[in-house]
Structure formats: structure tokens, C-alpha cells
């Protein structure tokens, strides 16, 4: 149903990393434009990305208001140049998105190893606490601020010349691993939310090896 020269959006997909959240859809518009609405289950609809020819809409500003809420979006299709026109049922064509709960579903961004410092046979490895777009009291919260103990990090490390990998986990952003003196090690980190059923792990951080500029060495 609807006007003959508009088609409903389809393949509505949430793309979200560290709470930066964009709704994408198809098709590329031909003689039509789109408006997006977003709502919590119990809230009112709020319109965004008015009469756009894009096939994506940044909804970050809305979802960061409460990342533990469940959100639903819908995409309306209008004829280009005649946005007052409606479908046969008296309203424009629209399609609903899947539900989206940012806290449970946003992808964990690729972590970065901020620094490593060797003191004797121990190496302190620090993973950067990435900033998110979630605000509290006018400051942006870090990933740790938002997830608290739900977020852990896993460190994979190995002797530079070896293939055997070891792992450690931490509830902070720091590791303190045992190494052999005079031996170079490489490592990468991964963010993990063990309690999740989807999107539990981030991609791996870039590999860092001892002897590179991020490291410090003390006897």
C-alpha cells in the first residue's frame, strides 16, 4: 500500500560501536526522502534526520540518554518534493527497526595498548580506557565508567620468538605479567563482556612488542 512512487525502507540495521550508533537501511532513494523516528518502549517518538536522501541516521544523541533502555526506530518514506503526501491508509509508508539495547548490544571498539613498562621480571601493561559519547554531569564517560565490572580485558602474550601464547584477564585496565629477563615479548588485548550473549568480544588491539617506543624498561 502507499503511493505508487515511494517504497518502504528495508534491511533496517543498527551499527553501534562504543555507543556511537547509526541506523542504516535500504534502498538508495529514487524520487523519495526519508525521516527517522526513535522511541523507547514506553516513550514518545522523536523525529531525526528529516527528509534526508541518506540511508543512514546517527541516533547516538538519543540512545546515550539511557544506554540501558531498549529502543525502536522506524523509517518513513515520502515522495521527493511532496512530503505531505501519504499512503492509502492516510499515513506515509514506514518500516520498523529491530529493537536495540545499547548496553547489551553495542560493539566493543578495538582496544589500544596505551603503555607497557618492564621492571625486572614483571611487565605492567595498560589498556587505554576509551572515551564514549555517553555523558554524565557534562563529562564524557569512558568504557569502564559505563560498564564497570561487566567489562574485563584479556591479554594475550608470547615470547617474540615463540608461537606459544599465554593469557591473563583483569577487571581493571592493567595487567602485571611475569616475563623472563632479557627476553622480548609481544602482546595484544581484547575487551570482553562475559555476561553478554551477543557481541561479547572486541576485535584484537594492534600487537605491541617490547623494544618499541611505547615501552619503558627499568632494572
Amino acid at each position: 500500500s502507499g503511493t505508487t512512487n515511494t517504497v518502504a525502507a528495508y534491511n533496517l540495521t543498527w551499527k553501534s560501536t562504543n555507543f556511537k550508533t547509526i541506523l542504516e537501511w535500504e534502498p538508495k532513494p529514487v524520487n523519495q526522502v526519508y525521516t527517522v523516528q526513535i522511541s523507547t518502549k514506553s516513550g514518545d517518538w522523536k523525529s531525526k534526520c528529516f527528509y534526508t536522501t541518506d540511508t543512514e541516521c546517527d541516533l547516538t544523541d538519543e540512545i546515550v540518554k539511557d544506554v540501558k533502555q531498549t529502543y525502536l526506530a522506524r523509517v518513513f518514506s515520502y515522495p521527493a518534493g511532496n512530503v505531505e503526501s501519504t499512503g492509502s491508509a492516510g499515513e506515509p509508508l514506514y518500516e520498523n527497526s529491530p529493537e536495540f539495547t545499547p548496553y547489551l548490544e553495542t560493539n566493543l571498539g578495538q582496544p589500544t595498548i596505551q603503555s607497557f613498562e618492564q621492571v625486572g621480571t614483571k611487565v605492567n601493561v595498560t589498556v587505554e580506557d576509551e572515551r564514549t559519547l555517553v555523558r554524565r554531569n557534562n563529562t564524557f564517560l569512558s568504557l569502564r565508567d559505563v560498564f564497570g565490572k561487566d567489562l574485563i580485558y584479556t591479554l594475550y602474550y608470547w615470547k617474540d620468538s615463540s608461537t606459544g601464547r599465554k593469557t591473563n584477564t583483569t577487571h581493571t585496565n592493567e595487567f602485571l605479567i611475569d616475563v623472563e629477563k632479557g627476553v622480548s615479548y609481544c602482546f595484544f588485548a581484547q575487551a570482553v563482556i562475559p555476561s553478554r550473549t551477543v557481541n561479547r568480544k572486541s576485535t584484537d588491539s594492534p600487537v605491541e612488542c617490547m623494544g618499541q617506543e611505547k615501552g619503558e624498561f627499568r632494572e
Partner: antibody
Framework: QVQLQESGPGLVKPSQTLSLTCTVS?????????WSWIRQHPGKGLEWIGE???????RYNPSLKSRVTISVDTSKNQFSLKLSSVTAADTAVYYC??????????????????WGKGTTVTVSS | EIVLTQSPGTLSLSPGERATLSCRAS???????LAWYQQKPGQAPRLLIY???TRQTGIPDRFSGSGSGTDFTLTISRLEPEDFAVYYC?????????FGGGTKVEIK
């Protein structure tokens, strides 16, 4: 040295809301620890209620989650517990505690290492 | 939730004797998350052991912890008068964090 002190009414009427505050002294509430509430029913064991990070991130015991709110006030170095719709079964000693990171096996894990003295709350009309 | 069962409920011993307290979990607990606490009457619990086997700063070496998986043990090698108290194991790996029911170590 960090010290914790619970405060709040010792008597609450059934169906009302229990409100307690824990004041942190000798350290900052924003220094990377978590802050917990635990209770102990008379002559019984310990029950974890929930915890909060300075940012406001919380975790609750699912058995109490529908009635519990834990909040933090970094400007006052305090965190608080609210437990709604109380009954006689909520009569207990309520403790606040610091959950601090300790090195273990290559990483850091959290343990409740500093506790308040506890405050007795009786639910009765 | 993970249920921690402590045994025995009460242990009657004399000063100088060895105390062995057991904590059994309903499912496997990562040692990293297992702690032991001591509580005396009218006082708050005190952290003794974390990571199943590491003594907290200031805790005498007569206290030791061991175990993995579902079976953990707290041992007091020679009981001192101040050791008579209730001891709780706790897991902090899975929400809700849970405590065992406690073992009371009393003077025989």
C-alpha cells in the same frame, strides 16, 4: 586510611522505603574502587545487595533488583542505598564496603577489603 | 546463582589445634574470585584471603587458603585465642556475589 560510616534511620515502617548513606573518609570515592552494600539478617549469613562505581555504573542482586537503588554523590564522597516496599524480612544489619582491586595471577580482581561498622535497621510498625 | 556450602557448621577446637574449614560451590568458581572473611561478634567481616590462596596484608601466616573449581579450604595451622570467630567464603565472579553460610570456630 579509608574508613566507611553508615547512617540512616534504625526503624522503618513496613511498605516504606529504607534509606541509608555511607560516607567515605580518608580517600576519594572516585579513585577506581567499587562501593558495595551487604546485609546480615539476625543470626544469619551475609547477603550482597549491590555495588556502584563512581560513574554511576551499578550491579544488583537479582533477588532484590526490583526494590533496590544504589546511587553515588562524588561531591559529598558518599553513596546511598534505597530499598523500597520493605517488610519484616528486611530487618538486618546493613554494611557498606569498599571493593578494591588486588593483583592476582597477572590481572587485578576486586575484593571487599574495608567495611563500615554496620547499622541495624528494624522494619516494624 | 552460585551456592556456597560451608562445612562444618560449627568447629569446636582448643587453642593450638589445627582448623580446617571447607567451602563447596554449586558450580565451578574461578580461583581469582574466591575470598575468605572472618567475623567476630558485633563486628564487620574482615578480608583474610583473596584469590583462594593469597593472604591479605597484615593477616598472620597461620591462615592459608587452597583449592580450585568447586572445592576450597581455609586452614588455620595453630589456633590463637583471637581466631575464634565465624568464617565465610565468598565468590565475586558471578552476579549475585554470594557468601557461604559460615563456619563458627568455637573454643572447646
Amino acid at each position: 586510611q579509608v574508613q566507611l560510616q553508615e547512617s540512616g534511620p534504625g526503624l522503618v515502617k513496613p511498605s516504606q522505603t529504607l534509606s541509608l548513606t555511607c560516607t567515605v573518609s580518608g580517600g576519594s570515592i572516585s579513585s577506581g574502587q567499587y562501593w558495595s552494600w551487604i546485609r546480615q539478617h539476625p543470626g544469619k549469613g551475609l547477603e550482597w545487595i549491590g555495588e556502584i562505581y563512581y560513574s554511576g555504573s551499578t550491579r544488583y542482586n537479582p533477588s532484590l533488583k526490583s526494590r533496590v537503588t544504589i546511587s553515588v554523590d562524588t561531591s559529598k564522597n558518599q553513596f546511598s542505598l534505597k530499598l523500597s516496599s520493605v517488610t519484616a524480612a528486611d530487618t538486618a544489619v546493613y554494611y557498606c564496603a569498599r571493593d578494591a582491586p588486588y593483583y592476582y595471577g597477572g590481572g587485578y580482581y576486586y575484593y571487599m577489603d574495608v567495611w563500615g561498622k554496620g547499622t541495624t535497621v528494624t522494619v516494624s510498625s | 546463582e552460585i551456592v556456597l556450602t560451608q562445612s562444618p557448621g560449627t568447629l569446636s577446637l582448643s587453642p593450638g589445634e589445627r582448623a580446617t574449614l571447607s567451602c563447596r560451590a554449586s558450580e565451578s568458581v574461578d580461583s581469582s574470585y574466591l575470598a575468605w572473611y572472618q567475623q567476630k561478634p558485633g563486628q564487620a567481616p574482615r578480608l583474610l584471603i583473596y584469590g583462594a590462596s593469597t593472604r591479605q596484608t597484615g593477616i598472620p601466616d597461620r591462615f592459608s587458603g587452597s583449592g580450585s573449581g568447586t572445592d576450597f579450604t581455609l586452614t588455620i595451622s595453630r589456633l590463637e585465642p583471637e581466631d575464634f570467630a565465624v568464617y565465610y567464603c565468598q565468590q565475586a565472579g558471578v552476579v549475585p556475589y554470594t557468601f557461604g553460610g559460615g563456619t563458627k570456630v568455637e573454643i572447646k
